[in-house]
């Protein structure tokens, strides 16, 4: 059984308020900022986590070349609107009535506009490329050991089904992890690749979202794998719509 039952805490989300007021006196946890009840046996959605973060007090080459439609999250933090299931609403607006459309991981995929901007649907991010540079080690990691350890990490820590880890590429010191998940592949209860990628990003930055003080401890054959840079590319099922002036 989990500490959530003993101490009434949320193992998968430290940005929650928990109390034993669920059915039968069971521990129930709600996300900060939104008050939405979360399932502490799995990852909390990125939208609810960003909302909680904004409400908290301020403090032969094997490598993949991302295509021209790949998005990088350059806009930084914002206080998002989430739907009742915790997903990002397709249209996001700030306090000054500037609006834009986002994909399923909350990254802007159109130019910014005003309140008349329409975002017809939430476009799914189906391919995520996590690009890492690891700190110097005595020698290169063995590729198959690294591959196995990262797949196990995503399965055990982030509860992501192994079929969604498409590939692990390695060219010292660069590691690339490819996550793929089409709308048709994602079954009820499956962790979303966007949520797994966000938890991983926070982990490698030393900002773990999991309860407890320990943080991520990742080793390959006993050798610590420490990340010094992370870049994440997001590819959507429908390419983004930006005007040409953005490219100049």
């Amino acid at each position: 059984h989990t500490a959530a039952q003993d101490n009434c805490t949320c193992p998968t989300n430290k940005m929650t308020v928990c109390s034993p007021d669920g059915p039968g006196g069971r521990c129930q946890c709600r996300a900060l900022g939104s008050g939405v009840a979360v399932d502490c046996s799995t990852l909390t959605s990125k939208c609810l986590l960003l909302k909680a973060r904004m409400s908290a007090p301020k403090n032969a080459r094997t490598l993949v070349r991302p295509n021209e439609h790949a998005l990088v999250d350059n806009d930084g933090l914002y206080d998002p609107d989430c739907d009742p299931e915790g997903r990002f609403k397709a249209r996001q607006c700030n306090q000054t009535s500037v609006c834009w459309c986002v994909n399923s991981v909350g990254v802007r995929r159109t130019d910014k506009g005003d309140l008349s901007l329409r975002c017809d649907e939430l476009v799914r991010t189906h391919h995520i490329l996590i690009d890492l540079r690891h700190r110097p080690t005595a020698g290169a990691f063995n590729h198959s050991d690294l591959d196995a350890e990262l797949r196990r990490l995503f399965r055990e820590r982030y509860r992501l089904h192994p079929k969604f880890v498409a590939a692990v590429h390695y060219e010292q010191p660069t590691i690339q992890i490819e996550l793929r998940q089409n709308t048709s592949q994602k079954a009820a209860g499956d962790v979303d690749i966007g949520d797994a990628a966000y938890y991983f990003e926070r982990d490698v930055k030393g900002e773990s979202l999991f309860q407890g003080r320990g943080g991520l401890d990742l080793r390959v054959r006993g050798e610590p794998l420490q990340v010094e840079r992370t870049l994440i590319y997001y590819l959507d099922e429908i390419p983004p719509k930006f005007s040409m002036k953005r490219l100049t």
Partner: nanobody, 126 residues
Framework: QVQLQESGGGSVQAGGSLRLSCAVS????????MGWFRQAPGKEREGVAV???????TAADSVKGRFTISRDNAKNTLSLQMTSLKPEDTAMYYC????????????????????WGQGTQVTVSS
């Protein structure tokens, strides 16, 4: 689903030995912080010993030199070898695991551990 199941508890005379075991399922024990805690009647749960994913171990001052924590990666089990037992070691002993791929920090805190076994009773008589 992660499950921890302790065994090996029992009654022993002071100065005797016991070996506790914890069978781990649904989790690779070698990838995360694992430990033993104990709780005597009317007292707080206290950390006894932990083992990190690196294999490095730490024991509480009260059991140093007497208790040894170890892990069998092939069998996915955690053990606690207890020697020179004292009456004050009498308690319910719990096996605990942190969320997968989590590190161990000192001082030991039960709040850092997600998964718990049901416990096994150790009674030491003088």
């Amino acid at each position: 689903q992660v499950q921890l199941q302790e065994s090996g508890g029992g009654s022993v005379q002071a100065g005797g030995s016991l070996r506790l075991s914890c069978a781990v399922s649904g989790l690779t024990s070698s990838t995360t912080c694992m430990g033993w805690f104990r709780q005597a009647p009317g007292k707080e749960r206290e950390g006894v010993a932990v083992i990190r994913s690196s294999g490095e171990t730490t024991a509480a001052d009260s059991v140093k030199g007497r208790f040894t924590i170890s892990r069998d990666n092939a069998k996915n089990t955690l053990s606690l070898q207890m020697t020179s037992l004292k009456p004050e070691d009498t308690a319910m002993y719990y096996c605990a695991a942190a969320w997968p791929y989590s590190g161990c920090l000192l001082p030991l805190s039960s709040g850092d551990f997600t998964y718990w076994g049901q416990g096994t009773q150790v009674t030491v008589s003088s």
